[in-house]
């Protein structure tokens, strides 16, 4: 019949698809690190560039005081690469840096801090041995995985030794997250 509408017997309601461009996301890049205090049982957190060069924060994802702030609950892909560099002559110094029983290694941890929970949560960890490599060594550690995060969660990247982080190029050391 002309002008008559036929509705399906089983109506399905579809939520409108959200444009990727509206989703919270950030890519932070390395900058020179300043000496910093850190908790006794926790590796120091890296400080990041949030705005210059390749770095950005978008759609309410904010960076402040070494933390990425999660603006809304959901599943996020979180990633970081930290490139370390040094010389084998530093291996004895690494050994003396309060970790005498551990191998000469470098470690990166992506940590979540939730205000309602007293202890930071380690989300991802990567460790490499460095002292068997050549006299001038470079070692990147990449971490990335999906996590369910809550609004207000804070993310940071901790490293075993800030002085070994290569901060010379923004494509060598970076940190980011985006809502899936």
């Amino acid at each position: 019949l002309k002008g008559q509408e036929f509705a399906p017997s089983h109506q399905q309601v579809y939520a409108p698809l959200r444009a990727d461009g509206d989703k919270p996301r950030a890519h932070l890049t390395v900058v020179r690190q300043t000496p910093t205090q850190h908790f006794k049982n926790q590796f120091p957190a890296l400080h990041w560039e949030h705005e210059l060069g390749l770095a950005f924060t978008k759609n309410r994802m904010n960076y402040t005081n070494k933390f990425l702030l999660i603006p809304e609950s959901g599943d996020y892909f979180i990633y970081s690469q930290v490139t370390f560099r040094g010389m084998t002559s530093e291996c004895s110094e690494i050994r003396q840096a309060g970790r005498p029983n551990k191998p000469d290694s470098i470690t990166v941890v992506i940590t979540k801090v939730t205000d309602s929970y007293p202890e930071p949560t380690q989300l991802l960890m990567g460790t490499k041995s460095v002292c068997e490599v050549g006299s001038n060594w470079f070692q990147p550690i990449y971490l990335g995985a999906m996590f369910s995060l809550q609004e207000g969660d804070k993310l940071m990247v901790n490293v075993s030794d800030i002085s070994l982080v290569d901060y010379t190029k923004e494509d060598k050391t970076f940190f980011g997250a985006f809502l899936l």
Epitope: V31, R32, T34, E49, E51, L52, G53, L54, T168
Partner: antibody
């Protein structure tokens, strides 16, 4: 010790293009953000824009249509071109280095006065 | 653009005085606030970065504080060489913006 030195003509005619070069000595031009900043006589400082060693630029929207900043890493230099100048562009022009947003402009050139006049 | 407002625009003080200059941002800039000193005919010189961190080589009589939108530069005991113009600048976002300065003069 890092040093920055501006060079270029001190007098430019209205409607012409202002061209300045900043030479960086005592350090590499890589891994830093290099800005141009200007200060009209007796007035406030105004950021013009920056260039990264990779060639990436960002400009002040108020000047964007007239500004080009370029870099020559082999010569440790970066340059400013400002087209269609008027008397309002008369200022001391500074080049400056920024390590990252957290650190401010830690090194500056001594500045060069550019007068726009016929 | 983020507007930066400094007060006072000028200030008279004597050697040995404690002086405070304030800077207000039009929106929150966390602690991305820098202070510069400029003497006549010279380029600005970075004194304080990240609101409260003293730049290398700057005397400890200079200090900075604040976060969010309100910031303060304090000179604990003025020295003859401190009479100059002081600028605040935000580095939270581009375009970078400066306050219009506080001229510190000898009383």
């Amino acid at each position: 010790q890092v040093q920055l030195q501006e060079s270029g003509p001190g007098l430019v005619k209205p409607s012409e293009t202002l061209s300045l070069t900043c030479t960086v000595s005592g350090g590499s031009i890589s891994s830093y953000f290099w800005s141009w900043i200007r200060q009209p006589p007796g007035k406030c400082l105004e950021w013009i824009g920056y260039i990264y060693y990779s060639g990436q630029t960002k400009y002040n929207p108020s000047l964007k249509s007239r500004v080009t900043i370029s870099i020559d890493t082999s010569k440790n230099q970066f340059s400013l071109k400002l087209s269609s100048v008027t008397a309002a562009d008369t200022a001391v022009y500074y080049c400056a280095r920024e390590t990252g947003s957290y650190y401010g402009f830690d090194y500056w050139g001594q500045g060069t006065l550019v007068t726009v006049s016929s | 653009d983020i507007q930066m407002t400094q007060s006072p625009s000028s200030l008279s003080a004597s050697v040995g005085d404690r002086v405070t200059i304030t800077c207000r941002a039009s929106q929150s800039i966390n602690n991305y606030l820098n202070w510069y000193q400029q003497r006549p005919g010279k380029a600005p010189k970075l004194l304080i970065y990240a609101a409260s961190s003293l730049q290398s080589g700057v005397p400890s009589r200079f200090s900075g504080s604040g976060s969010g939108t309100d910031f303060t530069l304090t000179i604990s005991s003025l020295q003859p060489e401190d009479f100059a113009t002081y600028y605040c600048q935000q580095s939270y976002s581009t375009p970078r913006t400066f306050g219009c300065g506080t001229k510190l003069e000898i009383k």
